[in-house]
Interface confidence: low
């Protein structure tokens, strides 16, 4: 599923991401835009053999199990395929664990490079939330 900007903002708010660990909703929508272009089915292979999955590009080395990544920790205790669902519950729940891990949203390279320090509220402007 490819979400619309406001559609995703509403879904993320419903799942409790607004101001989760101090990160406003705009941060999460911005991260999803530059990680996956709002596509729940996005996958990208990394040079270390791991793969990033879903709308927030969650990594199989640490967070989910795809049966293909040597040394996977599966800290979210989920199959990576769950992160590709049009229902973003699994991605959100895992993202909450990631953002609580110490580095906050710096764990997402795209957020660090494209969203951090920018007017992230622009990503939810005009949305009925």
């Amino acid at each position: 599923k490819v979400f619309g900007r406001c559609e995703l903002a509403a879904a993320m708010k419903r799942h409790g991401l607004d101001n989760y660990r101090g990160y406003s909703l705009g941060n999460w929508v911005c991260a999803a835009k530059f990680e996956s272009n709002f596509n729940t089915q996005a996958t990208n292979r990394n040079t270390d053999g791991s793969t990033d999955y879903g709308i927030l590009q969650i990594n199989s080395r640490w967070w989910c199990n795809d049966g293909r990544t040597p040394g996977s920790r599966n800290l979210c205790n989920i199959p990576c395929s769950a992160l590709l669902s049009s229902d973003i519950t699994a991605s959100v729940n895992c993202a909450k664990k990631i953002v609580s891990d110490g580095n906050g949203m710096n764990a997402w390279v795209a957020w660090r490079n494209r969203c951090k320090g920018t007017d992230v509220q622009a990503w939810i402007r005009g949305c009925r939330l």
Partner: antibody, heavy 115, light 107 residues
């Protein structure tokens, strides 16, 4: 139960192209990788590459880049592999398999003869 | 690419014998090694995943061991239905690679 059903045997002329299909049933097609494997007598098994049907993401063995092209139709739960510019070296049995690192579920194989 | 070398190429045994098939990797692949059996005109069948985990429905006489670069598939008291080709496969890195196979035949 999980099943992968491949298309039937093909006899093709050198230089032609062929498209092999692999229809998946019994599981969520979009969220598992489909792998393609080549087997020639005396050459063992060779991994050609893989596709994740839901996203269209593909990864190819360098050896088969330009030779194989993967696609998938999620409406029919079918993965396809097209082989182009066929030569006698492409004569083989081609398998699809569901990818989990290891391959528990396999298609029955499609025999391609280039002659 | 990781190269997998299987030995011996052919193993001639009598039913009831116990045998060991070897698979050696060109570099360490941890435990990311899987074993398949293939009969003529059939698709490969997964016997063992991740070096030593037996698949459901596979007879207990099949077992796997090893780590790093050296791996072994053992068959305790071979039965006639066990004859065929055996392949190892690594999933430690891309491209996935298979060994050249060991043919288990009746003496």
């Amino acid at each position: 139960q999980v099943q992968l059903q491949e298309s039937g045997a093909e006899v093709m002329k050198p230089g032609a192209s062929v498209k092999i299909s692999c229809k998946a049933t019994g599981y969520t097609f979009t969220t598992y990788w489909i792998e393609w494997v080549k087997q020639r007598p005396g050459h063992g098994l060779e991994w050609i590459g893989e596709i994740l049907p839901g996203s269209g993401s593909t990864y190819y063995n360098e050896k088969f880049k330009g030779k194989a092209t993967f696609t998938a139709d999620t409406s029919s739960n079918t993965a396809y592999m097209q082989l182009s510019s066929l030569t006698s070296e492409d004569s083989a049995v081609y398998y699809c398999a569901r990818g989990d690192g290891h391959y528990y579920y396999w298609g029955q194989g499609t025999t391609l003869t280039v002659s | 690419d990781i190269e997998l070398t299987q030995s011996p190429a052919t193993l001639s045994v009598t039913p009831g014998d116990s045998v060991s098939l070897s698979c050696r990797a060109s570099q360490s692949i941890s435990n990311n090694l899987h074993w398949y059996q293939q009969k003529p005109h059939e698709s490969p069948r997964l016997l063992i995943k991740y070096t030593s985990q037996s698949m459901s429905g596979i007879p207990s006489r099949f077992s796997g061991s090893g780590s790093g670069t050296d791996f072994t598939l053992s068959i305790n008291s071979v039965e006639t239905e066990d004859f065929g080709m055996y392949f190892c496969q690594q999933s430690n890195s891309w491209p996935r690679t298979f060994g050249g196979g060991t043919k288990l035949e009746i003496k």
